[in-house]
C-alpha cells in the first residue's frame, strides 16, 4: 500500500534569481484532486493553499510581492490528497540579486577567441564577498562558482563554438544574496566552418529581458522549467 504520493515540482516565475523589491511567484505542481498544498521555507511552514475545486487544479502559486534578503533561501512544497501526503519537492533556492554593488568582468585572452584556445573569465568586486558566480545566458545556462578575496578566476578550458554567448558574473554575499550583475561580456568563438555550422548557439532573448535575469528562453512545459531550475540550482550548491 502506497504511503506517500509522488513529489510535486517546484519552481519560481519569472526566475529563481529575483532582484530586490521585485515580485516573484513560487509555483508548486502536484496532482489533480490535491486538497492542500504547503510551502516550507528553510524547513518551516511558510504558507498554505487549498485549491478550489481540487479536482480541476494541479498547481498553486505563492506570491511574493517584494523580494528581500529575508525571503531568500530554500523552499520546498508538499501536497495532500485526502489524508495522504506527498513526498517533499526538490529544494528551490530563491536568490535575491541587486544587493549592494556591481562587479566587473573581463575575459582572457579577449572576447574573440579561436576554437581550442583556453579562456578564463575574471570577476572582481571590492566589497566584502569571497564567492563569485559566472553565468552564461541561454536555455542550457551554465553556472560556475569561484572564490577569492576581491576577484575570482573562471577557467573554461579549451573552448569550442558551444562556449560562445553572453556571460555575466555576480558577487555572492551568501548563498542566497547576490550583487548586481556585471556588465555582459560576449564571447565569440571562431572555428573552422564545418564546426561552426554544427554548433548552434544557445537560444537568446532580447537584451531588455535580462532585467529579470531570465536565464532560460520562453518557458515551455512547466516540468521542463522546474527540472532546469533544479539543475541550475544544483550547480550553485
Amino acid at each position: 500500500q502506497q504511503q506517500t504520493l509522488p513529489k510535486p515540482f517546484i519552481w519560481a516565475e519569472p526566475h529563481f534569481m529575483v532582484p530586490k523589491e521585485k515580485q516573484v511567484t513560487i509555483c508548486c505542481q502536484g496532482n489533480y484532486g490535491a486538497v492542500e498544498y504547503q510551502l516550507h521555507f528553510e524547513g518551516s511552514l511558510f504558507a498554505v493553499d487549498r485549491p478550489k475545486p481540487p479536482e480541476r487544479i494541479n498547481k498553486v502559486q505563492f506570491y511574493i510581492p517584494d523580494m528581500n534578503s529575508r525571503m531568500a533561501g530554500q523552499y520546498s512544497c508538499i501536497y495532500r490528497v485526502g489524508e495522504l501526503w506527498s513526498e517533499p519537492s526538490n529544494l528551490l533556492d530563491l536568490v535575491v540579486t541587486e544587493m549592494y554593488d556591481t562587479p566587473t568582468l573581463s575575459v582572457h585572452p579577449g572576447p574573440e577567441v579561436i576554437s581550442g584556445e583556453k579562456v578564463t573569465f575574471y570577476c572582481r568586486l571590492d566589497t566584502a564577498t569571497s564567492m563569485f558566480l559566472l553565468l552564461k545566458e541561454g536555455r542550457s545556462s551554465h553556472v560556475q562558482r569561484g572564490y577569492g578575496k576581491v576577484q575570482a578566476e573562471f577557467p573554461l578550458g579549451p573552448v569550442t563554438t558551444a562556449h560562445r554567448g553572453t556571460y555575466r558574473c555576480f558577487g555572492s554575499y551568501n548563498n542566497h544574496a547576490w550583487s548586481f550583475p556585471s556588465e555582459p561580456v560576449k564571447l565569440l568563438v571562431t572555428g573552422d566552418i564545418e564546426n561552426t555550422s554544427l554548433a548552434p548557439e544557445d537560444p537568446t532573448f532580447p537584451a531588455d529581458t535580462w532585467g529579470t535575469y531570465l536565464l532560460t528562453t520562453e518557458t515551455g512545459l512547466q516540468k521542463d522549467h522546474a527540472l532546469w531550475d533544479h539543475t541550475a540550482q544544483n550547480l550553485l550548491r
Epitope: 566587473t104 573581463s106 585572452p109 579577449g110 577567441v113 576554437s115 581550442g116 584556445e117 572582481r124 577557467p155
Partner: antibody
C-alpha cells in the same frame, strides 16, 4: 596603427622604487589586457603580470606579486608598473605587451639598479 | 606552473634551408601558444598566435603546427633577416610562461 611607447632607460638606486610607463595609442586602450614582461641581460623572458584597464582586474605572477604593482590611467591611455625595494637582480629590460595574446610589444625600458 | 621546453637552444643553418623549432608543454595548453621573434636591438614581434594563425604582415614562409603537447615553428626557406632569436609563449594558464629561446645563426 597600434603603438606602445616606453621610455628607453631608467637609472635608480638599490632599495628605491621606480614607476615604469607604457603609453598606448592607435586603439581603444580600455578594451585590451596589458601585460608586463621582464628580460634580464642575455636571459629569456618572464611574465610579471597583466591588468585590464576597463575593470582594473589584475593577475600577477606569484614571483613578482610582492614587488610589482600594476595600474592604469585611462585618461592618458597609459599603463604603469611600479617596482619596489629594487636590487641589482631587477636590472633588466621591461616590456609592455598588449592583449591576452601579446600581439603588440613596446620597445622596452632598460632599468639599471646601481648605486 | 606550466614549463615550456624549447629546442634547440641554438641552430646553425644556411640561407634557403628549412628549419623547425619545437616547444613542449608540461601541461595541456590547448592551442594557446604564440611564437615570437626578437631582434638584436630587443624589438619583439609576434609571428604566430593560437598555435597556427599567422600574424598579418608576417611572411608565409613561417608556419605553426601542433602534435599533442609539441608545438612547432617552421621556416620553409630561411632568409637573411630570419637569423635572430625565437621564443614560444603559452598564454593558456597564468603564470604565462616562455620557452628558453632559440638562437638561429647563419652557417
Amino acid at each position: 596603427q597600434v603603438q606602445l611607447q616606453q621610455p628607453g632607460a631608467e637609472l635608480v638606486k638599490p632599495g628605491a622604487s621606480v614607476k615604469l610607463s607604457c603609453k598606448a595609442s592607435g586603439y581603444t586602450f580600455t578594451s585590451y589586457w596589458m601585460n608586463w614582461v621582464k628580460q634580464r641581460p642575455g636571459q629569456g623572458l618572464e611574465w610579471i603580470g597583466m591588468i585590464h584597464p576597463n575593470s582594473d582586474i589584475t593577475n600577477y605572477n606569484e614571483k613578482f606579486k610582492s614587488q610589482a604593482t600594476l595600474t592604469v590611467d585611462k585618461s592618458s591611455s597609459t599603463a604603469y608598473m611600479q617596482l619596489s625595494s629594487l636590487t641589482s637582480e631587477d636590472s633588466a629590460v621591461y616590456y609592455c605587451a598588449r592583449h591576452g595574446r601579446f600581439d603588440y610589444w613596446g620597445q622596452g625600458t632598460t632599468l639599471t639598479v646601481s648605486s | 606552473d606550466i614549463q615550456m621546453t624549447q629546442s634547440p637552444s641554438s641552430l646553425s643553418a644556411s640561407l634557403g634551408e628549412r628549419v623547425t623549432l619545437t616547444c613542449r608543454a608540461s601541461q595541456d595548453i590547448g592551442s594557446s601558444l604564440n611564437w615570437l621573434q626578437q631582434e638584436p636591438d630587443g624589438t619583439i614581434k609576434r609571428l604566430i598566435y593560437a598555435t597556427s594563425s599567422l600574424d598579418s604582415g608576417v611572411p608565409k614562409r613561417f608556419s605553426g603546427s601542433r602534435s599533442g603537447s609539441d608545438y612547432s615553428l617552421t621556416i620553409s626557406s630561411l632568409e637573411s633577416e630570419d637569423f635572430v632569436d625565437y621564443y614560444c609563449l603559452q598564454y593558456a594558464s597564468s603564470p604565462f610562461t616562455f620557452g628558453s629561446g632559440t638562437k638561429l645563426e647563419i652557417k
